[in-house]
Amino acid sequence: FERTRSLQDPCSNCPAGTFCDNNRNQICSPCPPNSFSSAGGQRTCDICRQCKGVFRTRKECSSTSNAECDCTPGFHCLGAGCSMCEQDCKQGQELTKKGCKDCCFGTFNDQKRGICRPWTNCSLDGKSVLVNGTKERDVVCGPSPADLSPGASSVTPPAPAREPGHSPQ
């Protein structure tokens, strides 16, 4: 079957990194500079992705695979294949249209990207707050007050390292 297919379509013999050149009697020609073909039997090579602006090259283009970009320091990737870069913020902040802003009281962000999220409401699960939340960290929920009756093994909640973060906005 493979031989029959080859007789019918000489292009099927062209491996990745080459293209089937119609101008040269369907000879397999290497992809020109700054282009690639990741599969065999292709009639054209694709142009390599360039990493410009705030993108930087994570992986160089080769004759068989496209270049891959990531973001320069201070930015992080968004989307499949790092289709765009977004400014980093510090932990405890979120990116708004006016730049990086501290999380409001009752919210936190433990990453350099994304939005501030509300602290977990421990009481919804019938639990108590073991460690207070901050701008950078969620609260830690502990056993419910009823679980802390005499004789039950209890964990003494450590004093919070500092007051929960608060930012008037």
Epitope: Q50, G53, G79, A80, G81, I115
Partner: antibody, heavy 119, light 107 residues
């Protein structure tokens, strides 16, 4: 086939606000950046701002900071552009446009929405 | 913000080559795209990422971008190419800038 369908023409009074919608169909909505571009009569294209629905954060051109708000509703695959404190110079055709995934081109455009600001 | 400058108008005889320039500080360090817009219609992407042509765009459209200038070249210009052309730049973030536009007249 990707399509962006915008809401109809609007006539507004100076000082008021307008909200234009852009409904996407035929493709993944949340991973593509949607931008808003306006064109005043006889003038050029002007980028106002954009949003990536799946990530929520919007960005705006300096000129429109504080006056434009761009949002997206993933459940209906619809993007919105609200422009406040309208003045006569805001009379224009407003387009939504989708950025191709990995490159910088706007490969799909809405049909445009004419907003007329007149007292 | 980078500012993009285009000539207001360019004229070309049918079958000849039209070149439309777009200049801006270190424009070659960023991605350039080009759009064609005919009266009463939405813009159409003709070149993206400096020199790439979307499917369906004729081969006579090509682009380049280096130094401070991006150029849209239309070889063998046809009457149907008469339109306004806009350059646009992108730095990789959610931020874009358009040039002022060039009216291409096919004589």
């Amino acid at each position: 086939q990707v399509q962006l369908v915008q809401s109809g023409a609007e006539v507004k009074k100076p000082g008021s606000s307008v909200k234009v919608s852009c409904k996407a169909s035929g493709g993944t909505f949340n991973s593509y950046a949607i931008s808003w571009v306006r064109q005043a009569p006889g003038q050029g294209l002007e980028w106002m701002g954009g949003i990536i629905p799946g990530f929520g954060t919007a960005n705006y051109a300096q000129k429109f900071q504080g006056r434009v708000t761009i949002t997206a509703d993933e459940s209906t695959s619809t993007a919105y552009m609200e422009l406040s404190s309208l003045r006569s110079e805001d009379t224009a055709v407003y387009y939504c446009a989708r950025k191709n995934e990995e490159d910088g081109g706007f490969d799909h455009w809405g049909q445009g929405t004419l907003v007329t600001v007149s007292s | 913000d980078i500012e993009l400058t285009q000539p207001p108008s360019v004229s070309v005889a049918p079958g000849q080559t039209a070149r439309i320039s777009c200049s801006g500080d270190n424009l070659g360090d960023y991605y350039a795209s080009w759009y064609q817009q005919k009266p009463g219609q939405a813009p159409v992407l003709v070149i993206y990422d400096d020199s790439n042509r979307p499917s369906g765009i004729p081969e006579r459209f090509s682009g380049s971008n280096s130094g401070n200038t991006a150029t849209l070249t239309i070889s063998g210009t046809q009457a149907e190419d008469e339109a306004d052309y806009y350059c646009q730049t992108w730095d990789g973030t959610l931020h874009f800038v358009f040039g002022g536009g060039t009216k291409l007249t096919v004589l």
